[in-house]
């Protein structure tokens, strides 16, 4: 048993049929010695008396808020949560496996630049009685500070019969140098509590590996005289690290017909313009990627040809 | 500790070209190592990230773009002094800091070159003959060093009398390639910045 936060404790349980329960001794936080009684949750029934209450925690029915009282007055609370371990593996019932980039990916993180700011998100089908708490650091043995905000519900989607909820959190490394060469990964730890179930999820990464630039901005077409060709121009996204001559991007320009089946013409360039043939009803899209370290491509920025 | 914005100089172009080749070569070599050594811990998640140049050179700090010198998190490093002549420099126009930056890059390359050559000698003794260093990568390191053209003491190649542990050598190769790739990215960024300045 360990303390998650004040008056909230996590009991780690081996979750197999013939596992014994965990013996837990609850102590009432009071100088009083006599006349103390214990109740659980909303029930007013007395579960025991005395300054300590020894319980066996085996089921979710044994978890909950234990309260000690004296003469109708509440003295203290202890909320017990359960963390299940099945076949030596901690349960992952609360979050959905996103399976990208590999199986058992519950947390996904992205950074728009090298400033040390990043966003992580996760999915669940649970809509109520759900809380998240996020901590992060650079390295684990001698951790350096990363500050994370509160996790918030960022999207709701319907998937078949199920509703899916996306939560996200923004974090910022306390003292980040965009030009630094990372040798210690960022560690992100999410505590998830659903009703009386506790789970924790972790992700470890280098900022350089989760970079995904914003799409190029100000995408414009300039027709070339007496030609079907157009000059496409764009700019670096505002969110990209500066100076751009140091943090350079490379670009992919794509001409795509109305039909998804039509052949796509693609051009790669380090410049912020390109000359392409604009077909009728086609659209021109441009996306960006770090020129020197191949992490993710940005989403496409698009304009119609006509 | 910063790179001044100078007028463009054609003398920078050869270094930019060589640094691009270097990044391409080390990335290819790392990819090959990952594939060939698929049953070894060779991915970024599996290896320990070690920097053989740590406390010996200060490339990131010495080559910091001017715009980032206002960022205190980028300035917590030590001073290192280097020899200041090199053919990538437009001699009179180049500041002391740029010289320091380029000589730091040169020292990095020299250290990696020695390590890679020593390692290759060991890998050539492996009866499995599983993996060797790409000669192209070694050549590209050499070319960039020549383009930088710093006078520097030659570092003798390390020789070892004991029987090599090939498993450890291959893991060390992965660690070295990952670190060198990260340094090659920094070198490429620096050359691009200097080229645009």
């Amino acid at each position: 048993i360990w303390e998650l936060k004040k008056d909230v404790y996590v009991v780690e349980l081996d979750w197999y049929p013939d596992a014994p329960g965990e013996m837990v001794v609850l102590t009432c936080d009071t100088p009083e010695e006599d006349g103390i009684t214990w109740t659980l949750d909303q029930s007013s029934e007395v579960l025991g008396s005395g300054k300590t209450l020894t319980i066996q925690v085996k089921e979710f029915g044994d978890a909950g808020q234990y309260t000690c009282h004296k003469g109708g007055e509440v003295l203290s609370h202890s909320l017990l949560l359960l963390h299940k371990k099945e076949d030596g593996i901690w349960s992952t019932d609360i979050l959905k496996d996103q399976k990208e980039p590999k199986n058992k990916t519950f947390l996904r993180c992205e950074a728009k630049n090298y400033s040390g700011r990043f966003t992580c998100w996760w999915l669940t089908t649970i809509s109520t009685d759900l809380t998240f708490s996020v901590k992060s650091s650079r390295g684990s043995s001698d951790p350096q500070g990363v500050t994370c905000g509160a996790a918030t519900l960022s999207a709701e989607r319907v998937r078949g019969d199920n509703k899916e909820y996306e939560y996200s959190v923004e974090c910022q490394e306390d003292s980040a140098c965009p030009a630094a060469e990372e040798s210690l990964p960022i560690e992100v730890m999410v505590d998830a509590v659903h009703k009386l179930k506790y789970e924790n999820y972790t992700s470890s990464f280098f900022i350089r590996d989760i970079i995904k630039p914003d799409p190029p901005k100000n995408l414009q077409l300039k027709p070339l005289k007496n030609s079907r060709q157009v000059e496409v121009s764009w700019e670096y996204p505002d969110t990209w690290s500066t100076p751009h001559s140091y943090f350079s991007l490379t670009f992919c320009v794509q001409v795509q017909g109305k039909s998804k089946r039509e052949k796509k013409d693609r051009v790669f360039t380090d410049k912020t313009s390109a000359t392409v043939i604009c077909r009728k009803n086609a659209s021109i899209s441009v996306r960006a990627q770090d020129r020197y370290y191949s992490s993710s491509w940005s989403e496409w920025a698009s304009v119609p040809c006509s | 500790r910063n790179l001044p914005v100078a007028t463009p100089d054609p003398g920078m172009f050869p270094c930019l070209h060589h640094s691009q080749n270097l990044l391409r070569a080390v990335s290819n070599m790392l990819q090959k190592a990952r594939q060939t050594l698929e049953f070894y811990p060779c991915t970024s998640e599996e290896i320990d990230h070690e920097d053989i140049t740590k406390d010996k050179t200060s490339t990131v700090e010495a080559c910091l773009p001017l715009e980032l010198t206002k960022n205190e998190s980028c300035l917590n490093s030590r001073e290192t002094s280097f020899i200041t002549n090199g053919s990538c420099l437009a001699s009179r126009k180049t500041s002391f800091m740029m010289a320091l930056c380029l000589s730091s890059i040169y020292e990095d390359l020299k250290m990696y070159q020695v390590e890679f050559k020593t390692m290759n000698a060991k890998l050539l003794m492996d009866p499995k003959r599983q993996i060797f260093l790409d000669q192209n990568m070694l050549a590209v390191i050499d070319e960039l060093m020549q383009a930088l053209n710093f006078n520097s003491e030659t570092v003798p190649q390390k020789s070892s009398l004991e029987e090599p542990d090939f498993y450890k050598t291959k893991i060390k190769l992965c660690i070295l390639l990952h670190a060198f790739r990260i340094r090659a990215v920094t070198i490429d960024r620096v050359m691009s910045y200097l080229n645009a300045s």
Epitope: L40, E45, Q56 | -
Partner: antibody, heavy 119, light 107 residues
Amino acid sequence: EVQLVQSGAEVKKPGESLKISCQSSGYSFTTYWIGWVRQMPGQGLEWIGIMSPVDSDIRYNPMFRGQVTMSVDKSSSTAYLQWSSLKASDTAMYYCARRRPGQGYFDFWGQGTMVTVSS
Amino acid sequence: EIVLTQSPATLSASPGERATISCRASQSVSSWLAWYQQKPGQAPRSLIYAASNLQSGIPARFSGSGSGTDFTLTISSLEPEDFAVYYCQQYNIYPFTFGQGTRLEIK
């Protein structure tokens, strides 16, 4: 006052289905799991299983798994035990009981439902 | 599963006497053992939990002791209403199991 009131005695033929009930009152129904115990004529007590009234989480005795089904209706504070196809060997007194949280034993019992299966 | 063996199977005693019933487990159940009393035609009633804790409303003449594999239920001075069948139950490991019962009868 805590009370567990069970449905009346049943006489059934082999192969028939049956659902007996246990209605709780006088306490916070969702705080306490409900269990079932079998007592064959002239025999001792046998633990069938327990279930959570919150999310219908169930722990069956392997000996009874597939033979009986436990269920619960939170809105009426009622627990059920059912059979899809009765056998003569199911003849017994069935007790529902309230599981004490933080312990696991049964602190309050229903009066029992006698189930007789005979052709 | 854990087997609980009660002894004796039948205990003959007179009102006012001390009665002791034993319950032995096939493996340790820590202190997670309960005792129940069942009278003819009635449902069982909880007497003792966690080996030695008296259930609310049960007379103090009933007491329990033991831990691990050996447990004892003691009735310090028998009253006429105490003659019944007594069962021990372990609730440490699933499936929870009962002893076969001890019949306490009037001598």
